[in-house]
């Protein structure tokens, strides 16, 4: 008789999840000499230990502490790029501007990027059928708690000028319910962070509006200012040109507004 299995509203664990995490860890530690000491089998064991045999709606930050410990990594605190709803461009940017880092450029972020995972209470099985959805099922699920934990640490690590890339094509350019709006903004340390600089990325080629005047950006400015951190904002009207100019700053067309 097949055992009854909880049906969640979200997609199940990414196929070949253990192999993917292990392979990513090996690849990352080969590329980043400062992380060569990391034992990837131990990393996988710690990752697995965070959610296996646990109810997938009852995961805590403490469950991830062994993994976080193994994934300790120094990032240049004045070279941090946060993003919200515009991950691909943020990653394209840090691939060119190699001295800047998104969370997914760190080991822990790289391991988990775009993956889903969960287990089942009291069994050692990984659930490949379904996992809890943050809205429809529960917020304390393995994926959400992981990203909340590492995002908090990443924001706490930041200093000097912190940059955030925001999607100007969305109805809420700054969304208080995003990871950036609900976690990272509130964990920037005012004693260390002087300025948060927002880059609002425009979608349409003919869009010449000043999206820094958007009400949600003004809301972000208000939250940041109340935290004793300065705020500045720039429109990136042409993201394609922006990336091109990061690659080739000497290009004569890069002196004009992008």
């Amino acid at each position: 008789v097949p055992r009854w299995r909880q049906q969640w509203s979200g997609p199940g664990t990414t196929k070949r999840f253990p192999e993917t995490v292990l392979a990513r860890c090996v690849k990352y530690t080969e590329i980043h000499p400062e992380m060569r000491h990391v034992d990837c089998q131990s990393v996988w064991d710690a990752f697995k230990g965070a959610f296996i045999s646990k109810h997938p709606c009852n995961i805590t930050e403490e469950d991830y502490q062994p993994l976080m410990k193994l994934g300790t990594q120094t990032v240049p605190c004045n070279k941090i790029l946060l993003w919200s709803r515009i991950k691909d461009l943020a990653h394209q940017f840090t691939q060119v501007q190699r001295d800047m880092f998104t969370l997914e450029d760190t080991l822990l972020g790289y391991l988990a990027d775009d993956l889903t995972w969960c287990g089942e209470f009291n069994t050692s099985k990984i659930n490949y059928q379904s996992c809890p959805d943050w809205r429809k099922d529960c917020s304390n699920n393995p994926v959400s708690v992981f990203w909340k934990t590492v995002s908090r640490r990443f924001a706490e690590a930041a200093c000097d000028v912190v940059h955030v890339m925001l999607n100007g094509s969305r109805s809420k350019i700054f969304d208080k319910n995003s990871t950036f709006g609900s976690v990272e903004v509130h964990n920037l340390q005012p004693e260390k962070v002087q300025t948060l600089e927002a880059w609002v990325i425009h979608g349409g080629r003919e869009d010449s509006r000043d999206l820094c005047q958007d009400p949600t950006i003004k809301e972000l400015e208000s939250i940041i200012s109340k935290r004793n951190i300065q705020f500045s904002c720039k429109n990136i009207y042409r993201p394609d040109k922006f990336l091109q100019c990061v690659k080739n700053p000497e290009d004569s067309s890069c002196t004009s507004e992008i």
């Epitope: 502490q65 976080m68 410990k69 994934g71 300790t72 990594q73 120094t74 990032v75 240049p76 605190c77 969370l103 760190t106 822990l108 972020g109 934990t149 590492v150 640490r153 990443f154 706490e156 690590a157 930041a158 200093c159 340390q189 004693e191 260390k192």
Partner: nanobody, 124 residues
């Protein structure tokens, strides 16, 4: 709970070397659970990171101070120290030792624990 306490002279003459010590209690300075550093706040200015030392022994220093700074650890006394050479009046500040929890992404500026600070004045 980790506690940190700075000690050292409150007055240093120009061109001399400023030496401060931080005593750690409630945790082992040689534990891989923590990393250690120094920060300072000149009168009327923002906090400034000076440098950091990790469990591995590797050090990171503020580029603007790098040529004058040394941070070291004495595990037998559960202490770490700061030496800042060739001081001028611009080095007058409240100096804080600090500790950070060593997990996940961490910056060079530890901010999880901090001492009460000690005022160092550079004057002849």
């Amino acid at each position: 709970q980790l506690q940190l306490q700075e000690s050292g002279p409150g007055l240093v003459k120009p061109s001399e070397t400023l030496s401060l010590t931080c005593t750690v209690s409630g945790g082992s300075i040689s534990s891989s659970d923590y990393y250690w550093g120094w920060i300072r706040q000149p009168p009327g200015k923002r906090l400034e990171w000076i440098g950091t030392i990790y469990y591995s022994g590797s050090t990171y220093y503020n580029p603007s101070l790098k040529s004058r700074v040394t941070i070291s650890v004495d595990t037998s006394k559960n202490q770490f120290s700061l030496k800042l050479s060739s001081v001028t009046a611009a080095d007058t500040a409240v100096y804080y030792c600090a500790g950070g929890d060593s997990y996940g992404p961490v910056g060079q500026w530890p901010s999880d624990y901090r001492g009460q600070g000690t005022l160092v004045t550079v004057s002849s």
